[in-house]
């Protein structure tokens, strides 16, 4: 059931990995045998060196044999392999990074944990912040909006920078920046609410740099199933960081007796992590894991990158699907605790809440479930994809589609179960969220497959922008608006408070189904778009004249 195309067995999975390893061994042997003849001329400005006759390029999903190019004596020909910086030369191979790659991925994942820990520490003490600054609900909404909007606007900018400049420096600067801003925000006097708003906006910019660029470094450190695994670890940081953020926020506040101290924990850890990134993360070349090393010198304009991404159907559909996930998680995260509290009021197992926070216990349970299902979802998704890759080349989008469609069913069941059983509702939330989160790492992997290394950061950024714009930037407000609209035409009662919110939340499973459809659409174009990306990668390894991206 997990694989819809299991019959069409394509070259993939374990056999593909073994074949790749064998090809790499043979190529390393050939490279060691090639001596420098001293005939290597200077490369043309901006030109990528060309390979030896019959050389193979390790791409995202296998190898492509290239036609012999270049006359003897030109950079990259067999006689110059040792000294030329062409593909024929000895490249810094993924294997040569050894344990360093694992450490780099671990540090990047830790950074992602801190990214979300910081974000949700603020969420964990938001009531205290609101109380301290005298923030109204519209003010709290403004804080959220400013964060998301600045994140959205900054993401494409960092995408552009990430495809053109030193990524680990940008990453570290981003971490140092949001750490400094968060730390400073813990000292903002009560009368300067606008400074708090500004600080959230600046933190959004800092965090956008990380969310946009870090996955592309992982993409350049690993390939195939290893990359899926590493991206899974990286994206598991989201629920882990979120959960830890809530815990950090409330526990530090209680221990120190002042919520201000909660905002001083993640910045300290952030500074340490930023330093570790500078030290331990290798300055990988774009396409490094794809055995392209120094070949990817070709630069395209931002406008050209955008055009190429918009024409990339797999990328567009997977981005729309990601927006659907974002829509659902944003809306459910905001409203489910209150919805379950209202369900308990209707069932007469809880009192009507007149003084917020309402459903604090439900928020805690929901947070714990989200944290665990995030982990379970990422593991399940990665595992299912690994297995399905043995059967079909379309495994990635199909696993996502099945996860989404399955999730929609269980999200629908939440509203059925909540009327009579809160435990039943929590079970549906658990299964629904696990399935919904199963596509986190896979979506990132899809992007790595269908987008060439030199525009991956831009792609991640644009996807991030789209998913926030069409997703969680508006979904919590839209649900609230629909709920209020329904309530206006009904009598004021606890039952209708519960029902109106439930009917409004029913929009989520429909959007999730739509997301599933977008993943199915991705599956239609995935193989051809992946092949096109590999072909473009090979073209990037040609002399400048032949580069057509």
């Amino acid at each position: 059931m997990m694989c819809l195309e299991c019959a069409s067995a394509a070259a993939g999975g374990a056999e593909e990995e073994e074949a790749d390893a064998e090809r790499r061994r043979r190529r390393r042997g050939a490279q060691r045998g090639a001596g420098g003849s001293g005939c290597c001329g200077a490369r043309g400005a901006g030109g990528a060196g060309v390979s030896a006759a019959g050389d193979e390029v390790q791409t995202l999903s296998g190898s492509v044999r290239r036609a012999p190019t270049g006359p003897p004596g030109t950079p990259g020909t067999p006689g110059c392999a040792a000294t030329a910086k062409g593909p024929g030369a000895q490249q810094p191979k993924p294997a040569s990074l050894g344990r360093g790659r694992g450490a780099a991925a671990a540090i990047l994942s830790l950074g992602n944990v801190l990214n979300y820990l910081d974000r949700y520490t603020v969420a964990g003490v938001l009531l205290d912040i609101a109380q301290h600054f005298g923030v109204k609900d519209r003010g709290a909404g403004l804080l959220q909006s400013v964060f998301i909007c600045s994140f959205m606007v900054a993401a494409p900018i960092f995408g552009y920078l990430g495809d053109r400049f030193n990524r680990k420096v940008i990453l570290s600067c981003g971490i140092f920046f949001w750490s400094a801003v968060t730390f400073s925000s813990s000292f903002i006097p009560q009368q300067y609410f606008w400074l708090l708003v500004l600080s959230r906006g600046l933190v959004g910019i800092g965090e956008a740099s990380y969310s946009t660029i870090a996955p592309t470094i992982i993409g350049d450190l690993f390939t195939k199933n290893t990359r899926t695994l590493m991206l899974s670890v990286f994206y598991f940081a989201i629920p882990l960081g979120s959960g830890l953020g809530y815990i950090t926020g409330s526990s530090v506040k209680q221990a120190a007796g002042d919520w201000h101290w909660a905002l001083r924990v993640s910045p300290v850890l952030g500074m340490i992590t930023g330093t570790l990134i500078l030290i331990l993360v290798p300055a990988t070349k774009r396409g490094h894991a794809d055995q392209l090393g120094d070949q990817l010198k070709a630069r395209t304009s931002w406008l050209r990158d955008m055009k190429a991404l918009i024409r990339n159907r797999s990328y567009v559909f997977s981005s729309l699907a990601t927006s659907a996930v974002s829509f659902a998680t944003g809306a459910l995260g905001m409203w489910i605790p209150l919805y379950l509290h209202r369900a308990q009021v209707v069932q007469k197992t809880a009192e009507t809440c007149n003084s917020p926070p309402c459903g604090a216990k439900d928020s805690l349970i929901f947070g714990a479930i989200t944290c665990f299902t995030g982990f379970l979802g990422v593991v399940t998704g990665a595992g299912a994809t690994r297995w399905c890759r043995l059967k079909t080349q379309r495994a990635d989008p199909l696993v996502c589609a099945v996860g989404m469609l399955g999730s929609a069913i269980f999200i629908c069941l939440i509203f059925v179960a909540a009327k009579s059983s809160i435990v039943g509702a929590y079970i549906c939330i658990f299964v629904g969220e696990t399935l919904l989160f199963s596509n986190w790492a896979i979506t990132a992997d899809i992007l790595m497959y269908v987008v060439i290394p030199t525009r991956r950061a831009t792609a991640v950024a644009l996807q991030s922008f789209t998913s926030h714009l069409l997703g969680d930037a508006g979904s919590p407000y839209l649900i609230g608006f629909i709920s209020d609209l329904i309530r206006q035409s009904t009598k004021d009662s606890p039952l209708w408070e519960f029902l109106s919110l439930g009917y409004a939340l029913m929009l989520c499973p429909f959007v999730v189904v739509l997301g599933g459809m977008f993943f199915l659409a991705t599956a239609l174009f995935f193989v051809s778009d992946r092949a096109r990306a590999e072909q473009q990668v090979n073209q990037l390894a040609m002399p400048p004249a032949s580069v057509k991206v």
Epitope: Q131, H132, F133, G134, V135, K136, D137, R138, G139, L142, F187, P189, Q190, Q191, F193, V197, N354, S355, P356
Partner: antibody, heavy 125, light 107 residues
């Protein structure tokens, strides 16, 4: 011009109830946080209760000394704020001031920028 | 709860003199302190907000300073209408609390 006018004070016996009312004008009441502050004869000021605007779910906060006995409420359609005082004690004898918090649309100050003239509540047997 | 201590309880001055009234908080409260003046048989009125910010309609001879735990209300050349009780109030955390007041009287 901002105006706050308190009514409903008087002499009551311990254990009885009383409801104070504060009529307001000259500002957008529905957006504004309101408080009651009291002052016992010859003593200092003591904050009693705060009610936030509808945008903050009309959340109420109380001083520990009156929690569970007093209830603050508001009626935006009438631009009025109320203080329902139950189980009154001798030590509740004071002048009760209706106060307004300065409003900044997205947030509100916790200080009091306008005060009513006050209403006397005497609890005595 | 945050406790505010005002000193001195009573201050006797002659008109034209300049005075400083002190307010001390039991814990650090940044600049979340406000000053009120209450004349005899009148309602209090806001003089200074957030330790040092002036209020429209309040004479410029009133000024405030301080941060953390120690705050000062200064009156430059006291006038006859200034003889009244002055209260400080903290808004750093709920419950909102007032100081016991400082009575400014004619010497």
């Amino acid at each position: 011009e901002v105006q706050l006018v308190e009514t409903g004070g008087g002499l009551v016996r311990p254990g009885s109830s009383l409801k104070l009312s504060c009529a307001t004008s000259g500002f957008t009441f529905s957006d504004t946080w309101m408080s009651w502050v009291r002052q016992a004869p010859g003593k200092g000021l003591e904050w009693v209760a705060l009610i936030k605007d509808k945008n903050s779910n009309s959340e109420a906060n109380y001083a520990e000394s009156i929690k569970g006995r007093f209830t603050i409420s508001r009626d935006d359609s009438k631009s009025r704020v109320y203080l329902q005082m139950n189980t009154l004690r001798d030590q509740d004898t004071a002048t009760y001031y209706c106060t307004r918090h300065e409003d900044f649309y997205y947030y509100s100050g916790y200080y009091f920028d306008y005060w009513g003239q006050g209403v006397m509540v005497t609890v005595s047997s | 709860d945050i406790v505010l201590t005002q000193s001195p309880p009573t201050l006797s001055v002659t008109p034209g003199e300049s005075v400083s009234l002190s307010c001390r908080a039991s814990q650090g409260i940044s600049t979340s302190i406000h000053w009120y003046q209450q004349r005899s048989n009148e309602s209090p009125r806001l003089l200074i907000k957030y330790a040092s910010q002036s209020i429209a309609g309040i004479p410029s001879r009133f000024s405030g300073s301080g941060s953390g735990t120690d705050f000062i209300l200064s009156i430059n050349r006291v006038e006859s209408e200034d003889f009244s009780v002055y209260y400080c109030q903290q808004t750093y955390s709920l419950p909102l609390t007032f100081g016991p007041g400082t009575k400014l009287e004619v010497k």
